[in-house]
């Protein structure tokens, strides 16, 4: 999906208000420098790209983001912001039902959701430089 | 389009509690994105939230609770300590932007003692 | 909240007639306001979105037009199917909000 079109503003108000402290009760107990931070991104679009892919596609060690309530909002405010994102979601939504297995927090996804957190924090900083 | 087929109506006392179901099909989409509004007798429309428009109606905080699940594109509307003044229709929608352009058939609410 | 204002509450007109609804909202919204078709006992139809963007399967008569505060819902040439109360939304604050209604009466 190409993000281009998308309100980032609207997706902002979104992050700020609700998916951000998701993410922050997910991560409680951990140190905020207990992770470095590997993956970024370069502009608005690329950030989502990036935001989409690390929560709702599986990794190595950390199989089940996508059933985070900070996941669901996530998918929420890009199918209310982005326009047409609903539409390409059929496979990835038919493959999370087939998948429906026990939560288990493991290092592996909290390092992931540590990830997501400056990603989003590099999407409500569009104008600064990469560093 | 999406199709929304909302629960069948229901009377409750003051004081109670109300869950309405909304089961979407016909398309592919977050059920967490879901919004819910009602419409109390010769009333207008009325905003009630979606799971990320946190900031519920003031009238609202507190009293209602939105929640889905995935697993079968049910979104749910749960409305506690329910009053004379919460007999209305609701309804639940989806449109992108908030655009509603997909409704449910509503539930109507009867709150009577 | 941002308050949504509409106006005329209540109008009566005969059919070919051109009718306006204008909606006022409190604070700036830019173009983020949706345009509603209700008849009784059924649920919303959105007629219009963005302020001047006509949904799919609306006829042409119906047109938006506005931005930042003042709105306007124009039919060009009431028909018969058309006597129905409208609502205007806002969608750039949170919550959304809703206008309170005009209601297009037979004159």
């Known amino acids: 999906y190409d993000f281009t079109n998308c309100d980032f503003e609207k997706i902002k108000a979104a992050y700020l208000s609700t998916i951000s402290k998701d993410l922050i009760t997910y991560m409680s107990g951990t140190k905020s420098t207990e992770f470095n931070n590997t993956v970024s991104c370069s502009n608005r679009p690329h950030c989502l790209t990036e935001i989409q892919s690390l929560t709702f596609n599986p990794t190595a060690g950390c199989a089940s983001l996508a059933k985070e309530m900070f996941a669901m909002k996530t998918k929420a405010a890009l199918a209310i912001w982005c326009p047409g994102y609903s539409e390409t979601q059929i496979n990835a939504t038919q493959a999370m039902k087939k998948r429906r297995k026990r939560k288990v927090t493991t290092n592996k996804c909290l390092e992931q959701v540590s990830q997501l957190q400056g990603l989003w924090r590099r999407f409500n900083r569009p104008l600064l430089k990469q560093q | 389009q999406v199709q929304l087929v909302q629960s069948g109506a229901e009377v409750k006392k003051p004081g109670s509690s109300v869950k309405v179901s909304c089961k979407a099909s016909g398309g592919t989409f977050s059920t967490y994105a879901i919004s819910w509004v009602r419409q109390a007798p010769g009333q207008g429309l009325e905003w009630m939230g979606g799971?990320?428009?946190?900031n519920y109606a003031q009238k609202f905080q507190g009293r209602v609770t939105i929640t889905a699940d995935e697993s079968t594109s049910t979104a749910y509307m749960e409305l506690s300590s329910l009053r004379s003044e919460d007999t209305a229709v609701y309804y639940c929608a989806w449109g992108a932007k908030y655009a509603l352009d997909s409704w449910g058939q509503g539930t109507l609410v009867t709150v009577s003692s | 909240d941002i308050q949504m204002t509409q106006s005329p509450s209540s109008l009566s007109a005969s059919v070919g007639d051109r009718v306006t609804i204008t909606c006022r909202a409190s604070?700036?919204?830019?173009?983020?306001l949706n345009w509603y078709q209700q008849k009784p006992g059924k649920a919303p139809k959105l007629l219009i979105y963005?302020?001047?963007s006509l949904q799919s399967g609306v006829p042409s008569r119906f047109s938006g037009s506005g931005s930042g505060t003042d709105f306007t819902l124009t039919i060009s040439s009431l028909q018969p199917e058309d006597f129905a109360t409208y609502y205007c939304q806002q969608t750039d604050g949170n919550p959304p909000t809703f206008g309170q209604g005009t209601k297009v009466e037979i004159k």
């Open positions: 799971i990320i428009s946190i």
């Open positions: 604070q700036t919204i830019g173009t983020y």
């Open positions: 963005s302020a001047s």
